[in-house]
């Protein structure tokens, strides 16, 4: 999932991340009241040759681990991602000023896999 | 998708790609009869800021960018996977060598998208 | 016709880096990866990384521990494998091959002889 | 890393002969091993890939045979131009070579 990383050395295994974001980091705290911030967190780590149960792994996700086994310079790794998301109830301004309370689907990673 | 890759140059963004799979070439010829292979296509490319509507990007994946682009050492970028996937109808021997039609969902990778 | 041509011989001192070319022709450089494969006197051949000639995409063997940096110039339709650090260990032929996918190694360079000695 | 082994190591034989190669993978590698022929001074020459695919302008005297761990690369009658080394090669998972079979005149 992190292209741009140049690593040599094994990463490990697909799993969750624990990560806070705050509403004021993002930028976002003259339009969203509450909360200040969510725990967001994130999917990382790799999706290798055997995928074992724990990784949540598709049939196509299992192929595809198999494919780039022999075929690394064309087909990549699957990749970790999130596997269930929960939404999170934001309190906010809209472009009226208007104060509205709306559910935000997809907004907190519960579990990871590959993908 | 490809973390195990040194790439200094700007990748294409998410999109699917097509990738036919014998199954001889997985080595699966001896216990599936049909079909011979399928179409089962992958996933591939940058999930960078800002994600336009064609990536399909779920809320947290627009928030993870964010936050990506102020921590790239902590946090990757959201990963290029499959939205849709379809499944295929394969004929096999079981353990028993019976003859057996069964279903196999999430085979084939119909959109992608950033997540 | 198809075919990978290589940059002449070379003789480095030990220490220095040696970056050698592989300009392919008569097909679309770009759908495939260039492979490096060495061959020291009397030794089996030896993988030494690839490029994805399109994406840019690479990736080293181990064995060479950050030694070996693989580049393509698209628009020159050359690929190169630079070494760095050398010892006398690495004096061999040095080749680039193409592959495509679900395939081996189906064309090859001439070949490149790096002697290094001090 | 997956290790390739041939044997033998030096091949003495005649024109005409018939001549075998045989090539061990340290894991099985399915059907995923090419043959390839090397003169001296010369790149190596792809013969055979999946095991027993003939590549195209390679002569029918050549053929490959073999799965999961045991290959064999087959020359029925041996002429002149065959006098070369040749090397097996996985090509399963990342690459490695045989450590290359020399076939001489006898």
């Known amino acids: 999932s992190a292209s741009d990383y140049n690593s040599s050395e094994l990463k490990t295994a697909c799993r969750k991340h624990e990560l806070y974001v705050s509403f004021q980091d993002l930028g976002w705290q003259d339009w969203i009241i509450a909360p200040k911030g969510y725990a967001a967190n994130y999917c990382d780590g790799e999706c290798s040759f055997p995928l074992n149960a724990h990784m949540n792994a598709t049939n196509h996700a299992i192929v595809q681990t198999l494919v780039h086994l022999m075929n690394p310079e064309y087909v990549p790794k699957p990749c970790c991602a999130p596997t269930k998301l929960n939404a999170i109830s934001v309190l906010y301004f809209d472009d009226n000023s208007n104060v509205i309370l709306k559910k935000y689907r997809n907004m907190v990673v519960r579990a990871c896999g590959c993908h | 998708s490809a973390s195990d890759y040194n790439s200094s140059e700007l990748k294409t963004a998410c999109r699917k790609h097509e990738l036919y799979v014998s199954f001889q070439d997985l080595g699966w010829q001896d216990w599936i009869i049909a079909p011979k292979g399928y179409a089962a296509n992958y996933c591939d490319g940058e999930c960078s800021f800002p994600l336009n509507a064609h990536m399909n990007a779920t809320n947290h994946a627009i928030v993870q960018t964010l936050v990506h682009l102020m921590n790239p050492e902590y946090v990757p970028k959201p990963c290029c996977a499959p939205t849709k996937l379809n499944a295929i109808s394969v004929l096999y021997f079981d353990d028993n060598s019976n003859v057996i039609l069964k279903k196999y969902r999430n085979m084939v990778v119909r959109a992608c998208g950033c997540h | 016709q198809v075919q990978l041509v290589q940059s002449g011989a070379e003789v480095k001192k030990p220490g220095a880096s040696v970056k050698v070319s592989c300009k392919a022709s008569g097909y679309t450089f770009t759908s495939h990866a260039i492979h490096w494969v060495r061959q020291a006197p009397g030794q089996r051949l030896e993988w030494m990384g690839w490029?994805?000639?399109?994406?840019?995409?690479?990736k080293q063997s181990q064995n060479f521990q950050d030694r070996v940096t693989i580049t393509r110039d698209t628009s020159a339709s050359a690929a190169y494998m630079e070494l760095s650090s050398l010892r006398s260990e690495d004096t061999a032929v040095y080749y680039c091959?193409?592959?495509?996918?679900?395939?081996?190694?189906?064309?090859w360079g001439q070949g490149t002889l790096v002697t290094v000695s001090s | 890393d997956i290790q390739m082994t041939q044997s033998p190591s030096t091949l003495s034989a005649s024109v005409g002969d018939r001549v075998t190669i045989t090539c061990r993978a340290s894991?099985?590698?399915?059907?995923?091993l090419a043959w390839y022929q090397q003169k001296p001074g010369k790149a190596p020459n792809l013969l055979i890939y999946?095991?027993?695919s003939l590549e195209s302008g390679v002569p029918s005297r050549f053929s490959g045979s073999g799965s999961g761990t045991e290959f064999t690369l087959t020359i029925n009658s041996l002429q002149p131009d065959d006098f070369a080394t040749y090397y097996c090669?996985?090509?399963?998972?990342?690459?490695?070579f045989g450590q290359g079979t020399k076939v001489e005149i006898k």
């Open positions: 999946k095991a027993s």
């Open positions: 490029i994805h000639a399109g994406n840019g995409n690479s």
């Open positions: 894991q099985s590698i399915n059907n995923w």
């Open positions: 091959a193409r592959r495509a996918i679900m395939a081996p190694f189906d064309l």
């Open positions: 090669q996985q090509y399963y998972s990342s690459w490695t």
